[in-house]
């Protein structure tokens, strides 16, 4: 029950996160005009990843797309790439996780397959969230750098009678949406990975039956040779025949692929 809840919650949190990443990527307000000493502005500039906009006091808003690809800063291209990778990975993760949900029955899909898919989607969500956080952080860093550069420029060359007011840009709403969304996707991914551990079929907890032969003792372990699904503690199909009889609890456990949470 707890596993299903964790998986379901992870899915929902990731879904909200990915929706947020998509929203942030599409938003125009990645950077907004800094109203440092002029809170009342007649012309307000803001920029997104795909276009820049100007909102006039009259209410008219005009947006222009960045129609050039080569003329754009490399950093902006990198941010675009990170956000798109994040969305693509997140979308694939959502698709995989739908089939992995314990509450959804698809044919005769085994729990082992569901666990595998849950882990896959969890990792995808984690990477998706990290891509979004990285993209937003790179853009924020770019803004901070430009902000201080334009601030320095504002106080140079003011000797003449005519002042040229340099437009400075600060963090837009999309950055905060992106950070929160990336964080949610990351949390959702971690929850999916945690849920995966509970979904992985465990060994039946029997005590090993010991057969004492006259010559030497051999312990028969139930499920000694598993089908190579990659699940369960005996992932390497290693024979569990050793010199003497042991109980199940004494057997060396090998790290499964679900231990990296």
């Amino acid at each position: 029950m707890a596993v299903t809840a964790c998986q379901g919650l992870g899915f929902v949190v990731s879904l909200i996160g990915i929706a947020g990443i998509i929203a942030a990527t599409c938003m125009d307000q990645w950077s907004t005009q800094d109203l440092y000493n002029n809170p009342v502005t007649a012309v307000f500039n803001y920029q997104g990843l795909w276009r820049s906009c100007v909102r006039e006091s009259s209410g008219f808003t005009e947006c222009r797309g960045y129609f050039t690809l080569l003329g754009l800063p490399a950093m902006l291209q990198a941010v675009r790439a990170l956000m798109i990778v994040g969305i693509v990975l997140g979308a694939i993760g959502l698709l995989v996780s739908i089939f992995a949900l314990k509450c959804i029955r698809i044919g005769s899909m085994e729990d082992s397959a569901k666990a595998n898919m849950t882990l896959t989607s969890g990792i995808m969500f984690i990477v998706s969230g990290l891509c979004a956080i990285a993209g937003v952080s790179v853009f924020a860093n770019m803004l901070v750098t430009n902000f201080w550069m334009s601030t320095a420029n504002m106080y140079t060359g003011m000797g003449g009678m005519v002042q040229t007011v340099q437009t400075r840009y600060t963090f837009g709403a999309a950055l905060f949406v992106g950070w929160v969304a990336g964080g949610l996707t990351l949390i959702g991914g971690v929850m999916m990975c945690i849920a995966c551990r509970g979904l992985a079929p465990e060994e039946t907890n029997y005590k090993a039956v010991s057969y004492h032969a006259s010559g030497h003792s051999v312990a028969y372990k139930p499920g000694g040779f598993k089908a190579s699904t990659g699940f369960g503690s005996n992932t390497k199909n290693k024979k569990i025949y050793d010199g003497g009889a042991r109980t199940e609890d004494e057997v060396q456990s090998y790290p499964s692929k679900h231990d990296y949470v």
């Epitope: 005009q33 002029n38 009342v40 502005t41 007649a42 012309v43 500039n45 803001y46 920029q47 820049s52 906009c53 100007v54 006039e56 006091s57 009259s58 209410g59 008219f60 005009e62 222009r64 005519v162 002042q163 040229t164 007011v165 340099q166 437009t167």
Partner: antibody, heavy 118, light 113 residues
Framework: EVMLVESGGGLVKPGGSLKLSCAAS????????MCWVRQTPEKRLEWVAT????????YYPDSVKGRFTISRDNAKNTLYLQMSSLRSEDTAIYYC???????????WGQGTSVTVSS | DIVMTQSPASLTVTAKEKVTMSCRSS????????????LTWYQQKPGQPPKLLIY???TRESGVPDRFTGSGSGTDFTLTISSVQAEDLAVYYC?????????FGSGTKLEIK
């Protein structure tokens, strides 16, 4: 046809109050940012106040801030300017105008005259 | 506040002559976001309210004859009437639309001989 008709002007003593109205027709009033602009006897134009389409914000120059209040009634398609603590330098023709693309005042009323004198 | 300075204060010309009037702002009116200059020109005929002629420094309002042309960028702007007509007798005002408070120039009075 766009029409803006101002009313409420007149002669008032210094320190007195007056409320101007502007009736709008021929356009979707509640979609437009509206302004009051005045023209002094020396023919100088001065922006007096701006109000957003949805009544969310108002702007005033320092010369009238705290004394003048711009408001609007979108249901009645009417713009108002409440003027108090009037001074002789407030004597002017007061025009109401709509703010269009480029923040330009694209439609003007005929104006109403306000004289502040003792 | 942005100060708008118009010159000359008055002009007397003959019909069909080309006329140029100037407007200068104390700060740049060029908006970097859309590369537009937030300067407007108005025409006020005697006994009438001002009428919008040109916005964004060079965009003619609909219905305005094409003999009116606005030009300039940053702080220096010009209104040109290519062939003055008798009905162009008016005072021409420029206005800063870039930042509050919106400010107007003192006007250029155009008179016809």
């Amino acid at each position: 046809e766009v029409m803006l008709v101002e009313s409420g002007g007149g002669l008032v003593k210094p320190g007195g109050s007056l409320k101007l109205s502007c009736a709008a027709s021929g356009f979707t009033f509640n979609n437009y940012v509206m302004c009051w602009v005045r023209q002094t006897p020396e023919k100088r134009l001065e922006w007096v106040a701006t109000i957003s389409s949805g009544n969310f914000y108002t702007y005033y120059p320092d010369s009238v801030k705290g004394r003048f209040t711009i408001s609007r009634d979108n249901a009645k398609n009417t713009l108002y300017l409440q003027m108090s603590s009037l001074r002789s330098e407030d004597t002017a023709i007061y025009y109401c105008a709509s703010l269009g693309r480029g923040n330009a005042l694209d439609n003007w009323g005929q104006g109403t005259s306000v004289t502040v004198s003792s | 506040d942005i100060v708008m300075t118009q010159s000359p204060a008055s002009l007397t010309v003959t019909a069909k002559e080309k006329v140029t009037m100037s407007c200068r702002s104390s700060q740049s009116l060029l908006n970097s976001g859309n590369q537009k200059n937030y300067l407007t020109w108005y025409q006020q005929k005697p006994g009438q309210p001002p009428k919008l002629l040109i916005y964004w420094a060079s965009t003619r309002e609909s219905g305005v004859p094409d003999r009116f042309t606005g030009s300039g960028s940053g702080t220096d702007f010009t209104l040109t009437i290519s062939s003055v007509q008798a009905e162009d007798l008016a005072v021409y005002y420029c206005q800063n639309d870039y930042s509050y408070p919106f400010t107007f120039g003192s006007g250029t009075k155009l008179e016809i001989k």
